[in-house]
């Protein structure tokens, strides 16, 4: 369990991630929760991966914003859009690959402030 806080004092929110593992060739979930906001349009979710130039996924103004998405994640990601309003920023990942392993950052912006937390994601053939 990793709990992260925003950097800017009173304008910080708590973001919580859980280290997880994904089976190669199957679908995985990268877990992330945050202090909810009352307005969906005020929430921005960014998933980033260490060593990857583009974004893993971005959700803002109530919809997926994928113009900056890295090609290795194209067509493979989704948030639980109906659960964002209650503070769920978890990411669905389709067709997990060996190269998906690594450190991910769940970065959140709401009207209350900003926050982020890292997540270690392991991949392999788990039973």
């Amino acid at each position: 369990l990793i709990i992260g806080f925003g950097i800017s004092g009173r304008h910080s929110i708590t973001v919580t991630t859980v280290a997880s593992a994904g089976n190669i060739g199957e679908d995985g979930i990268l877990s992330c929760t945050f202090e909810p906001d009352i307005k969906l349009s005020d929430i921005v979710i960014q998933w980033l991966k260490e060593g990857v130039l583009g974004l893993v996924h971005e959700f803002k103004e109530g919809k997926d914003e994928l113009s900056e998405q890295d090609e290795m994640f194209r067509g493979r990601t989704a948030v639980f859009a109906d659960q964002v309003i209650v503070g769920n920023a978890s990411l669905r990942l389709k067709n997990v690959q060996l190269t998906d392993a690594g450190t991910y950052k769940c970065y959140i912006i709401t009207s209350k402030g900003k926050g982020n937390a890292n997540l270690e994601y392991k991949t392999g053939a788990f039973s």
Epitope: G25, L66, S67, Q69, G75, T77, R92, N95
Partner: antibody, heavy 121, light 107 residues
Framework: QVQLQESGPGLVKPSQTLSLTCTVS??????????WSWIRQHPGKGLEWIGN???????YYNPSLKSRVTISVDTSKNQFSLKLSSVTAADTAVYYC?????????????WGQGTLVTVSS | DIQMTQSPSTLSASVGDRVTITCRAS??????LAWYQQKPGKAPKLLIY???SLESGVPSRFSGSGSGTEFTLTISSLQPDDFATYYC?????????FGGGTKVEIK
Amino acid sequence: QVQLQESGPGLVKPSQTLSLTCTVSGGSISSGGYYWSWIRQHPGKGLEWIGNIYYSGSTYYNPSLKSRVTISVDTSKNQFSLKLSSVTAADTAVYYCARGLSTIDEAFDPWGQGTLVTVSS
Amino acid sequence: DIQMTQSPSTLSASVGDRVTITCRASQSISSWLAWYQQKPGKAPKLLIYKASSLESGVPSRFSGSGSGTEFTLTISSLQPDDFATYYCQQDNSYPYTFGGGTKVEIK
């Protein structure tokens, strides 16, 4: 519900560029959450996925056609388009536009009715 | 690219028959498989997505099963409206690919 309609010339000369437009009604391309695809079907044959686009303009093309394909979007007109350059008789097909179910599940629904494009001089 | 192989290519059946069509992927695609029905001169119609989820409005006589590399579409009791060509499609990874089709014709 969302409906799609292809439009464009039914006859294109060899070596020229095939241009088709898909007009979306009953929903906004800009609402996000979906990839918009082009798919073709050669006469009496199976289906071939050409490529797709997100409302923000991000594209992915089938490597077999990548060097000749351009897909673009015009959110103000609620349309997306296909351009296929240097066509030959082998590009004669019914061209369909379609929407994926979500950003992660690209089973296609709905589809346009399709438009036959013949490449001939 | 992932190759999708359907069998049989043609199937002769009668109204009321139970019909099964198979689709095999050249590598594992988990459950990322869709089935379509196409009638002459018409666009394909989505029947099943994610291997076994029935698309809204599709009759319950259609069902899908399988995961990994082997999938089946079953029509529990063939109706006159079901004589058509059926295609499978993988959306596990780019480029998305379709099977060659199975034509279900009247015996």
